[in-house]
Amino acid sequence: MKVLQEPACVSDYMSISTCEWKMGGPTNCSAELRLLYQLVFQSSETHTCVPENNGGVGCVCHLLMDDVVSMDNYTLDLWAGQQLLWKGSFKPSEHVKPRAPGNLTVHTNVSDTVLLTWSNPYPPDNYLYNDLTYAVNIWSENDPAYSRIHNVTYLKPTLRIPASTLKSGISYRARVRAWAQHYNTTWSEWSPSTKWYNSYREPFEQR
């Protein structure tokens, strides 16, 4: 049994780190493998993660962790029974992928404006809470040529779009993702998308 692609891990900077790797051949990850991890810290214990399959030769493990601080460093050992397949380390603060924003809602009852709101995925006491900026993707199922990215670089998780910039009488979808500039993170996954119908019509005089 051999590791084809070494484990690569990312942290959500809250409580979960996700490690993914590829094996040399088809593997029942949960039955054959264990990923052991231990914080390099006085009197810390070794913890075990049972991986799941992620495609035929891929495995993924979700490591339960404490709140992340910059000093945290974990040792990682990938075992197949009594055989050590790989040994490495992981510093969560240097490999951050934020959680996806949630509760994306579209408010169309605001005059002349489409208001999108979503929730910050972190509690106020988390360091990422005040560092997230967002990208909102809006596209139309009726008009495949229409897709826009709106960068939200302010803290408030809202975006206002003049309804007049969207075509009337067709449906749109939106989704949002986040990243944290000062932590040099990757982008989060996209939130689930939400759909709305743009029924806005310009006043007669402006037509």
């Epitope: 914080l39 006085q42 009197s43 810390s44 070794t46 404490d66 601080v69 945290d72």
Partner: antibody, heavy 125, light 112 residues
Framework: EVQLVESGGGLEQPGGSLRLSCAGS????????MTWVRQAPGKGLEWVSS????????YYADSVKGRFTISRDNSKNTLYLQMNSLRAEDTAVYYC??????????????????WGQGTTVTVSS | DIVMTQSPLSLPVTPGEPASISCTSS???????????VDWYLQKSGQSPQLLIY???KRASGVPDRFSGSGSGTDFTLKISRVEAEDVGFYYC?????????FGQGTKLEIK
């Protein structure tokens, strides 16, 4: 009441052995790392050894490494210090102390918040 | 190993007056914001040590509020706002960031 009670001290000749015990009560013993600290007559405090809650992680001062062994029996709520190849400089009062909570991914530290009454070890010919 | 240096080693104090003990470590004891792994212990004559302050500034359960800890990184201070006769004994700082845990030499507080 949270309590630690040491026993097993005594007079031993150089090169001899002693086994110290520390019985814990009033707290969930297996959740806490434990530590041994000693104090030679008229001297300050010196850390000797520590062990994680499960017993998998053990740590020793250079002065006792290879001679002393720390262990624990969580079913008996008891900490041990096996002392071999004793030397005159091991003469001291030995204290056990409750250390950090190691059930967490990053063990929670509240100081060495409970100490035993101490047991005296004298190494002399 | 981390070296802990205490001063003064002897501290005569008049009851009711404040007292201050300093402790310097040879490397930073700050693990994360607000978490300095330094403790203060008091050992009274013929007794086991007792915890006063942990993580630099957190008062242990049952410790009178006249005791306070401060500092960060490598420089730490234990203050007693008004010394009482029962406060006599040896005071030790200890680093618990990593093993070997190391203690300061001890400060003997006595009443003038």
């Amino acid at each position: 009441e949270v309590q630690l009670v040491e026993s097993g001290g005594g007079l031993e000749q150089p090169g001899g052995s002693l086994r110290l015990s520390c019985a814990g009560s009033g707290f969930t013993f297996r959740d806490s790392a434990m530590t041994w600290v000693r104090q030679a007559p008229g001297k300050g405090l010196e850390w000797v050894s520590s062990i994680s809650g499960s017993g998998d992680g053990t740590y020793y001062a250079d002065s006792v490494k290879g001679r002393f062994t720390i262990s624990r029996d969580n079913s008996k709520n008891t900490l041990y210090l096996q002392m071999n190849s004793l030397r005159a400089e091991d003469t001291a009062v030995y204290y056990c102390a409750k250390d950090r909570l190691s059930i967490y991914i990053r063990p929670r530290y509240y100081g060495l918040d409970v100490w035993g009454q101490g047991t005296t070890v004298t190494v002399s010919s | 190993d981390i070296v802990m240096t205490q001063s003064p080693l002897s501290l005569p104090v008049t009851p009711g007056e404040p007292a201050s003990i300093s402790c310097t470590s040879s490397q930073s004891l700050l693990y994360s914001i607000g978490y300095n792994y330094v403790d203060w212990y008091l050992q009274k004559s013929g007794q086991s040590p007792q915890l006063l302050i942990y993580l630099g500034n957190k008062r242990a359960s049952g410790v009178p509020d006249r005791f306070s800890g401060s500092g960060s990184g490598t420089d730490f201070t234990l203050k007693i706002s008004r010394v009482e006769a029962e406060d006599v004994g040896f005071y030790y700082c200890m680093q618990a960031l990593q093993t070997p845990y190391t203690f300061g030499q001890g400060t003997k507080l006595e009443i003038k």
